[in-house]
């Protein structure tokens, strides 16, 4: 009986099992019982990542600088190009098809995790005892100044956006 299923790295066509083309190649013609599957290497700028029977390889991804993209890893005949974003930008999706500017943390918030090429800035509210008075993509919450260590006293309490104001201790007259 003709086969109804084939081994791994084979495919069924015309009642027979043909070898798939290996990664980095594309199908030219199916096998016959007299000749093996005919495959050819992918052209420059193309790739195939899996064992396949595709008649065309896939185009390498283009990292468009107009979208803030640059090449992180050059594609091969078996792998796609990997794009990342220019400094100060991050990918809008896992596929990294476009970039957006890193978010800045507003006053009252500090940077918990600095942005990378693939993830945005993560901000956190400054807890009691800490403040941030700038909008920044890098600055963490800073601790309030310790007036005591300077032999000073708190003249104005700090907030999540402002530092404490220290002043001299009142002298006993």
């Amino acid at each position: 009986e003709p086969p109804t299923a084939c081994r791994e790295k084979q495919y069924l066509i015309n009642s027979q099992c043909c070898s798939l083309c290996q990664p980095g190649q594309k199908l030219v013609s199916d096998c016959t019982e007299f000749t093996e599957t005919e495959c050819l290497p992918c052209d420059s700028g193309e790739f195939s990542a899996q064992w396949n029977r595709e008649i065309r390889c896939h185009q390498h991804k283009y990292c468009d600088p107009n979208l803030g993209l640059r090449v992180q890893q050059k594609g091969t005949s078996e792998t796609d190009t990997i794009c990342t974003c220019e400094e100060g930008w991050h990918c809008t999706s896992e596929a990294c098809e476009s970039c957006v500017l890193h978010r800045s943390c507003s006053p009252g918030f500090g940077v918990k995790q600095i942005a990378t090429g693939v993830s945005d800035t993560i901000c956190e509210p400054c807890p009691v005892g800490f403040f941030s008075n700038v909008s920044s993509a890098f600055e963490k919450c800073h601790p309030w100044t310790s007036c005591e260590t300077k032999d000073l006293v708190v003249q104005q309490a700090g907030t999540n956006k402002t530092d404490v104001v220290c002043g001299p201790q009142d002298r006993l007259r």
């Epitope: 003709p2 027979q16 016959t32 019982e33 007299f34 000749t35 093996e36």
Partner: antibody, heavy 117, light 107 residues
Framework: EVQLLESGGGLVQPGGSLRLSCAAS????????MSWVRQAPGKGLEWVSG????????YYADSVKGRFTISRDNSKNTLYLQMNSLRAEDTAVYYC??????????WGQGTLVTVSS | DIQMTQSPSSLSASVGDRVTITCRAS??????LNWYQQKPGKAPKLLIY???SLQSGVPSRFSGSGSGTDFTLTISSLQPEDFATYYC?????????FGQGTKLEIK
Amino acid sequence: EVQLLESGGGLVQPGGSLRLSCAASGFTFSSYAMSWVRQAPGKGLEWVSGIGSYGGGTYYADSVKGRFTISRDNSKNTLYLQMNSLRAEDTAVYYCARYVNFGMDYWGQGTLVTVSS
Amino acid sequence: DIQMTQSPSSLSASVGDRVTITCRASQSISSYLNWYQQKPGKAPKLLIYAASSLQSGVPSRFSGSGSGTDFTLTISSLQPEDFATYYCQQYGRNPPTFGQGTKLEIK
């Protein structure tokens, strides 16, 4: 025991026709691809034609395409090669062979075809 | 069609010799190559398939190697019955094609 026995060869004039037969025994004929290979006197081997198993496709060398036709009768366990418009350069011993995994593992003893006026 | 070129076309050797026959394809055929032996007045016999696999019943002194475009058939220690003509045959592209043959003669 696998056996392949060719017949039908002989002397024929240029432009003439001939039909070769290959009687198979000792194996399940319908399950195997079969082919014809020829060898001109004192020369090397030339693959002429092949036919797939299970009523599979037919394939030909460019030198015989359009002139030769391969066929099989699984009920008679017989392979055929119909040769038309024969030329002097078709003179050769014609072998039928059984195919397995892209190799010809059993061959007949051959039948001589002579094309001459 | 893929051209198969064997070398040498003929060679003389003695019993016990180690002999190597080469076959070159005009384009890459991966490991899709067979070797046959033919004695005068007889049909060819399959020796090696898929470049390096020994056909059942063939003595282990025969071996094959190579891939891409360059292949070799080696007989490790020639026996009297090994004097014959050897052919390579590719099955990487349609139609299958043979080399022109290498005639192995007694020195």
